[in-house]
Structure formats: structure tokens, C-alpha cells
Interface confidence: low
């Protein structure tokens, strides 16, 4: 439906508190490295126009997308060529290419100094002081550094934010009742932005074709009693707001992601029996628990797929007649019976039945020809078991800081030309997956792991996509979104790999490592062993362990030393000449 | 199917003390980090204290630094909480949980600490 004014709709939709705040996430997402002030500036101007507008939808300028006056606004910056050089290009461009061009130009791995918490004190008197500035910090600091990051989910956690510092800034101690509460945001909000981000890739990527996919396959799993109209119907709703927040639309993709909870909540007696609690939250709550509600139970005496799909006369007809429809109908049917498997499973078997009726009904004898497709399919499944065993049983061995070793290693050794730090923050995340995962039942421990899987080689993706160095790494990352993981793990050592020089440097450490916390004293360790391997691509697993070992003895030594830069001086030398004696370096 | 079974609490004397034990059952117990937490009644939930997998690391809200120890057997698969020289403010009942998530675990063990 069209409205004169698309500024006002919105803003009228939403109210001015979510107006502004989505408006601050855009433009924060879009210029990554303006100073808070700016923005604030730039949205208060925005809103008081916007202001205008649900006024008189008539006045001037009120008629135009919203494209163009936030593009408009963000081009008046003053310092755009020197702070983001040929971004400012993309000023003389008109829409819709000037705000692709915005796009293309968000930064993954922007250059912005590591958030760092302040006491708690000095957060609860800022928190006090300004409430609303303390807020929109926060929503500003988490936007430049995830410019994908879901807008209407960053809303939610800024009120839990808000929540946090409410209730703990007035509890007798404060530490205790804040901190694990803002390391859990942390944490989730690093998760929540990371499956964004391959939300947005896919989308991206491989086209709408693949999300609508992956939306069928993870919705039918989820909803497994409602029909597949009304799975459909989700589908195309979560499809369009998920490309609009990828998109930058993010205004639409709040609003049209509240229409989409209120019919799911109206609907929720043919979708989900799950979904009542989440029904009776708050907008942002609902959302978010709708996003996270547990799969529903199976229906009871669920047909054979074989009869409608290989069994079936009419298998060639169908497909013909609506390719797209059946082969939707196929994975919706499998992933309703199948929640122990991952969503990218499902989608490899989806594909290698789509392919088999490609072959076969073109063949003499077509259902001759397809009879056994579901013979192909096991292969499928039981390599992603097997590998999850597999690991599990290394994890459970080694526990998470170990198992994250053995996979630096493994991922080193696979693809040493990607820079360390995101070796190390790749290979990091890539471990946590046991202790997200293997602690499940077998039947659940498919769709955690390999689901997460795909999130975090999705980062490596993004990450290397911005400075490709290693042609192994864009081939598993370009050809097939389902079989990313398949094809990292099917990759050996790489032999045309020139070992790095020995420096020295790389080895010298100082002490300050001791005042460090255990997370970031391991990353520091982990990077040494990243650039081991890197200098000594053929070490052994022992010959790794025995420097390791040595490594964090020397650390363990000098951090109880009277003199620790003397002692990890002196002690340091010692420790590289031990080391390339065992390495043979 | 992961469970987690707290016991020993219990009415105790303002200044008493009281071993809390958390039984851990369908995962792999020694992998993982643990907590305490505790909810009062009519509070939100508050962290108690942390242990990490090992054993060797533990960390303690200030309100029961120096009066409460975590410690874990991982060949029992048992978390513990040993609570001396206990207050009145101490009454809660008591979750133990994976990780250092302030989110309940089991049903609880209420501690209730009068005269």
C-alpha cells in the first residue's frame, strides 16, 4: 500500500523512540568511523524532518524514499573523502546505486580500537547522568562494528542493556549482579551478529532462491505440525524482512518484522503449540523468543516420503509442472521428520534430489532411473555424524582451550596464508563448538554443530573476502553455501605453502602478558602457535605440544619472577633457541 | 538429557554453615566450567561463584568472598559449595549451573539462614 509520505509512515508505525534509534543504527552501520556526536546530529536532523512530514505529508521533500534522504543526510558529512576515501564516491552516484554502493562499502573488520569495559562505577554514574546518551552509545558502538547486525534484535538488546544497568546499578554489589550480565550480552551479541551476517550472506551471495531454502528447511523443523502453504507464507514474509535489514532498509525491515510476530501470534494455532508464552511478551521480547522457540513436536504417523517423492507415477509431472514448489514440498516434508539434522544437511539432500529428477526425468525410463535416490542420501548423512563423533570425542579428550589448539593446527596447516589473528579468531569460535554442542543428545547434536559451523566459516568468508589471500579459501567459499563445511573439512595440508621466515620478534613477550586476563593470555599463546605452525608447516602434533608446554612454563615462571622483563628477557632467548633446536627451525 | 541435582541446603543459625552438592548428569562434567547462583526471595537471579573445568580457577561475587568455596570432583561428576559464617542476606535457594551464565540449572536447594 502506498503512502504519500514514506518518512512519515514509518515513523508514525514505529514511534519516534524506535525511529531514532534504527536511524542511528543505519547510519552507524553505513559510516563506520564518524564520531558518536556526528550521528547524533545527523539523526536529530532526520527526526525533526521527519516530524515535518507526519504533519503535512505534503511538505517539501516528505515524498522522498528514505533512500534518498538518509543517503542525502549521510553525504553532507564534511569529512567523508578523508575519513573513507573512495566511499565518498559514492555520493555523486543516484539512487539505487548510491546506496549499493554504501553496501558494498560496510566493513567487517573495521579498524576501531577493542571495546574496552570501564569500572562499574563509572559506568552507573554515566548511566545516571544521561540515560538516553549512555543508551545510544551503546546502540552506536555495536552498529560500526557489526554493520549487519539485525537492527530490530539490536533493539532488544538494548533493553535488556537498559535492563542490566537499572536493576544492578542500584544492587549493594554491583560487580557481581552487572558483569555476568553484560558478558552474556556480549557473548549472545556476538552470536546474534555472526548468524546475521550469514543470513545477509546468503541472501548476498547465492541469491533469494538460497534463503528461501534454508527458511523452508529450518521453519518446517520448527513448525512441523502447520501446513506447507503457511510454511511458505513465513517464508516469503522472513524472506523480505531479512532483505530489507541486509539491505539497509531497516526502517521497513522493524516494521515489517513486528507484522510478521503479530501474524504469527494471530496464527499460532495452525503454525506452533509453542508458541504461547513468546505470544504474551512485550514487541521486542516476542520477536526475539519467536526467533528462538524450540521445535514443536512431530505429528504422530507421519507418512512414508517414498510414495509421494520416489514411489509416485506423477514424480516427473510434478516436477516439471512447478520445479520450484516441489522440490520446496520435498524439503519441507523431509525437515518436518528429520529435526536431527542440520539445516545445511537437509539442503545437500534437497540438491541431490533436485539433480537426480534434472538426470532422470530427461532419461528413457525415469522412475527406473530415480528409484534409489534415497540410497544416495545416506552417505550424505553419515559423513556430518561421523565427523561430529569424531570431534566430540577429541573435545571431550582435550576440553575447549586444548580442542581449540588442535583446530588451530588442523585450519593453519589447511590455509596458512590467512592472516593470523583471524586464524586464531576463526579456529577460537570453531572450538567452541563443543562446548555449545557436545553436551547434547545425539539427536540434537547435528543441527547444533553443523548449523554453527556454517556461522562461523561464514565469518572466515567475510573476513578473507576483504583481503583474499588463498585461492583454497574462496573456492570452498564461493562455489556451494551448503557445502562450505564439507569442503574445509575435505582439505589436507597445503603443500605449495612457502614457509615464513623465523623472526624472532613474533617470539618476544613481555610482562604484561601477566596482567592479562585467561582468555586473552590464551589468545596470545594461540598466536604463537599459529605462527609455529606457519614457520614449520610439517611439525608434529608432539613436537607443537613440547613448545607449547615450554611456552606456557616460561610464562607460568616469569609471571612469579621478582624481575619478570629480566626473566622473560633472558628466559625468552632460551625459549627460541629451545624451540628451533625441537623444530628444527 | 542434561540434569542437574542440587541438595543440602537447609535451616541454619545466623554465623552457622552448610555444604551445598550439585549432582551433574548426561554431559561430559569435567569439560565444563560451573557456577552457583542464588535468587532471594522476591530478587532476580544474582552469580554466586565460578569454577572453571579443572578446578583451578575459581571466582566469587563480593557479597561471599572469603565466607563460601567452590569446589568441584570431576571423577564424582559433583559440583560443591562449602557456606560458612552465614547472614540473614543469604537466604535464597541456590541453582547451580553450566558455565558462568547467571541462569538457573536445576530445581534448587533453599538455604534459609534465622535465628
Known amino acids: 500500500d502506498a503512502h504519500k509520505s514514506e518518512v512519515a509512515h514509518r515513523f508514525k508505525d514505529l514511534g519516534e523512540e524506535n525511529f531514532k534509534a534504527l536511524v542511528l543504527i543505519a547510519f552507524a552501520q553505513y559510516l563506520q568511523q564518524c564520531p558518536f556526536e556526528d550521528h547524533v546530529k545527523l539523526v536529530n536532523e532526520v527526526t525533526e524532518f521527519a516530524k515535518t512530514c507526519v504533519a503535512d505529508e505534503s511538505a517539501e521533500n516528505c515524498d522522498k524514499s528514505l533512500h534518498t534522504l538518509f543517503g542525502d543526510k549521510l553525504c553532507t558529512v564534511a569529512t567523508l573523502r578523508e575519513t573513507y576515501g573512495e566511499m565518498a564516491d559514492c555520493c555523486a552516484k543516484q539512487e539505487p546505486e548510491r546506496n549499493e554502493c554504501f553496501l558494498q562499502h560496510k566493513d567487517d573488520n573495521p579498524n576501531l580500537p577493542r571495546l574496552v569495559r570501564p569500572e562499574v562505577d563509572v559506568m552507573c554514574t554515566a548511566f545516571h547522568d544521561n540515560e538516553e546518551t549512555f543508551l545510544k552509545k551503546y546502540l552506536y558502538e555495536i552498529a560500526r562494528r557489526h554493520p549487519y547486525f539485525y537492527a530490530p534484535e539490536l533493539l532488544f538488546f538494548a533493553k535488556r542493556y537498559k535492563a542490566a544497568f537499572t536493576e544492578c546499578c542500584q544492587a549493594a554489589d554491583k560487580a557481581a549482579c552487572l558483569l555476568p550480565k553484560l558478558d552474556e550480552l556480549r557473548d549472545e551479541g556476538k552470536a546474534s551478529s555472526a548468524k546475521q551476517r550469514l543470513k545477509c550472506a546468503s541472501l548476498q551471495k547465492f541469491g533469494e532462491r538460497a534463503f528461501k531454502a534454508w527458511a523452508v528447511a529450518r521453519l518446517s523443523q520448527r513448525f512441523p505440525k502447520a501446513e506447507f502453504a503457511e510454511v511458505s507464507k513465513l517464508v516469503t514474509d522472513l524472506t523480505k524482512v531479512h532483505t530489507e535489514c541486509c539491505h539497509g532498509d531497516l526502517l521497513e525491515c522493524a516494521d515489517d518484522r513486528a507484522d510478521l510476530a503479530k501474524y504469527i501470534c494471530e496464527n499460532q494455532d495452525s503454525i506452533s503449540s509453542k508458541l504461547k508464552e513468546c505470544c504474551e511478551k512485550p514487541l521486542l521480547e516476542k520477536s526475539h523468543c519467536i526467533a528462538e522457540v524450540e521445535n514443536d513436536e512431530m505429528p504422530a504417523d507421519l507418512p512414508s516420503l517414498a510414495a509421494d517423492f520416489v514411489e509416485s507415477k506423477d514424480v516427473c509431472k510434478n516436477y516439471a509442472e512447478a520445479k520450484d514448489v516441489f522440490l520446496g514440498m520435498f524439503l519441507y516434508e523431509y525437515a518436518r521428520r528429520h529435526p536431527d539434522y542440520s539445516v545445511v544437511l537437509l539442503l545437500r539432500l534437497a540438491k541431490t534430489y533436485e539433480t537426480t529428477l534434472e538426470k532422470c526425468c530427461a532419461a528413457a525410463d525415469p522412475h527406473e532411473c530415480y528409484a534409489k535416490v534415497f540410497d544416495e542420501f545416506k552417505p550424505l548423512v553419515e559423513e556430518p555424524q561421523n565427523l561430529i563423533k569424531q570431534n566430540c570425542e577429541l573435545f571431550e579428550q582435550l576440553g575447549e582451550y586444548k580442542f581449540q589448539n588442535a583446530l588451530l593446527v588442523r585450519y593453519t596447516k589447511k590455509v596458512p596464508q590467512v592472516s593470523t589473528p583471524t586464524l586464531v579468531e576463526v579456529s577460537r569460535n570453531l572450538g567452541k563448538v563443543g562446548s555449545k554442542c557436545c553436551k547434547h543428545p545425539e539427536a540434537k547434536r547435528m543441527p547444533c554443530a553443523e548449523d554453527y559451523l556454517s556461522v562461523v566459516l561464514n565469518q572466515l568468508c567475510v573476513l578473507h573476502e576483504k583481503t583474499p589471500v588463498s585461492d583454497r579459501v574462496t573456492k570452498c567459499c564461493t562455489e556451494s553455501l551448503v557445502n562450505r563445511r564439507p569442503c574445509f573439512s575435505a582439505l589436507e595440508v597445503d603443500e605449495t605453502y612457502v614457509p615464513k621466515e623465523f623472526n624472532a620478534e613474533t617470539f618476544t613477550f613481555h610482562a604484561d602478558i601477566c596482567t592479562l586476563s585467561e582468555k586473552e593470555r590464551q589468545i596470545k599463546k594461540q598466536t604463537a602457535l599459529v605462527e609455529l605452525v606457519k614457520h614449520k608447516p610439517k611439525a608434529t602434533k608432539e613436537q607443537l605440544k613440547a613448545v607449547m608446554d615450554d611456552f606456557a612454563a616460561f610464562v607460568e615462571k616469569c609471571c612469579k619472577a621478582d624481575d619478570k622483563e629480566t626473566c622473560f628477557a633472558e628466559e625468552g632467548k632460551k625459549l627460541v633457541a629451545a624451540s628451533q633446536a625441537a623444530l628444527g627451525l | 538429557e542434561v540434569q542437574l541435582v542440587e541438595s543440602g541446603g537447609g535451616l541454619v543459625q545466623p554465623g552457622g554453615s552448610l555444604r551445598l552438592s550439585c549432582a551433574a548428569s548426561?554431559?561430559?562434567?569435567?569439560?565444563?566450567?560451573m557456577s552457583w547462583v542464588r535468587q532471594a526471595p522476591g530478587k532476580g537471579l544474582e552469580w554466586v561463584s565460578a569454577i572453571d573445568s579443572g578446578g583451578a580457577d575459581t571466582r566469587y561475587a563480593e557479597s561471599v568472598k572469603g565466607r563460601f568455596t567452590i569446589s568441584r570432583d570431576n571423577s564424582k561428576n559433583t559440583l560443591y559449595l562449602q557456606m560458612n559464617s552465614l547472614r540473614a542476606e543469604d537466604t535464597a535457594v541456590y541453582y547451580c549451573?553450566?558455565?558462568?551464565?547467571?541462569?538457573?540449572g536445576g530445581q534448587g536447594t533453599t538455604v534459609t539462614v534465622s535465628s
Open positions: 549451573t553450566i558455565g558462568r551464565s547467571a541462569s538457573r
Open positions: 548426561g554431559f561430559t562434567f569435567g569439560s565444563f566450567g
